[in-house]
Amino acid sequence: SPSGVRLVGGLHRCEGRVEVEQKGQWGTVCDDGWDIKDVAVLCRELGCGAASGTPSGILYEPPAEKEQKVLIQSVSCTGTEDTLAQCEQEEVYDCSHDEDAGASCENPESSFSPVPEGVRLADGPGHCKGRVEVKHQNQWYTVCQTGWSLRAAKVVCRQLGCGRAVLTQKRCNKHAYGRKPIWLSQMSCSGREATLQDCPSGPWGKNTCNHDEDTWVECEDPFDLRLVGGDNLCSGRLEVLHKGVWGSVCDDNWGEKEDQVVCKQLGCGKSLSPSFRDRKCYGPGVGRIWLDNVRCSGEEQSLEQCQHRFWGFHDCTHQEDVAVICSG
């Protein structure tokens, strides 16, 4: 059975022609019976997002080399396996590179869901707090307090994928004054607009505002965590919420202090310091792996306050997902 698997020739590491490794040699997989359940397992094994398609492998450039072998005739997964190696497989008896299988998982870095290109919160701690700036004709402009409302702040927070607006009427501190042109004032949002640019406003650049009237908005950064797959809310595989998406945490560097912070944040008492075997009984996750190399002192009130790599940066698979068991 294959000892390694990869996707070759796609836009990103989570898409491409399927290649498996056997005895140190990389070869392709025939697409006989290849379907979305097989791709789901492959995506899970690679730590990619959900399966999004089963494209023909021969579309990917460059094509498989002539001397490369087709190593597997067919794969038959139920969709619940952790790796392709756990699925039923047939050895090759009749297949050419014209039938190479392809796979497409959700790209961890992008999607056709809109990215908030036209608004940002600048000079704040994180992307959900800061001075409101809006992009117009490739130039960033600040927004004047005049006419600003809770409804406008709601629109900004929603547009940025942040939580609810918690601070809306504050002016910027001197050190956070903008240096950009002042965009406009008299924003009159209903609160239902998709973007700030959809709100009626005064004309671009025509106002009598100063930078000491620049608007500062704070939204809840929707960080949250949960334990899934356990008998209760205080045990299970750890998942964290970031930018509205749940994802797992890699166990690199994970230990007692990190356990304690999670249990504390969830109001679940103390960590029961589970064994490696106990931690593994909750199985691997799917989708995003959000955090890696988490380091806590144990004093933090929230896992978010612990040190960790940038969100989404990791070198892990879902086999390394953290699980935590608290006293409850």
């Epitope: 796609g10 836009l11 990103h12 898409e15 697409d31 999004s52 398609g53 089963t54 494209p55 023909s56 021969i58 579309l59 990917y60 450039e61 014209d98 392809g102 497409s104 790209n107 870095e109 992008s110 999607s111 056709f112 869901s113 809109p114 990215v115 290109e117």
Partner: antibody
Amino acid sequence: EVQLVQSGAEVKKPGASVKVSCKASGYTFTGYYMHWVRQAPGQGLEWMGWINPNSGGTNYAQKFQGRVTMTRDTSISTAYMELSRLRSDDTAVYYCAGGRIDAFDIWGQGTTVSVSS
Amino acid sequence: DIQMTQSPSSLSASVGDRVTITCRASQSISSYLNWYQQKPGKAPKLLIYAASSLQSGVPSRFSGSGSGTDFTLTISSLQPEDFATYYCQQSYSTPLTFGGGTKVDIK
């Protein structure tokens, strides 16, 4: 809003070249292939090729090999398609279409290219 | 190159009718087939991918079936906004190729 906005109509003489642009907004430009498809007046659709906006790698239909060049500028999320040695039967609407390697999820509004002497 | 043949090339139907369009490939393409809708003066729109998967936002009255060489697009109950031209497209190998189109107009 996810959209592709193409450059305006062009009128060209036979033998000339045309370069059509396609600006993406509302999504991660490098996250999807950009295909080019054309449609002659009253005719069906014809795939010309794709560009991988990440790497700049291309795959052209054999029919257009040697005459078509697809490029991109990731800093402005824009793809380009240049067709050289134009003939009258290149008169068509040229579409850019973003999506998977095997399907065209979102389309530009189209650019009319007229070739006549 | 893989040739895609659509039939009929045009059909007339009434609102509420069940409409079926077929597409045949010159060789087996497994389930690597997509369907598009195009209205006059507009860009095409993806309806169905991988032979039977409904693209997000497309009404459920559209469905696709088939594998190998023969495929079908069905509109279960034709609506006024469905009068358009429909194209199939194979995604088995490059060059990606389209059928000649089926124009659905009002009876």
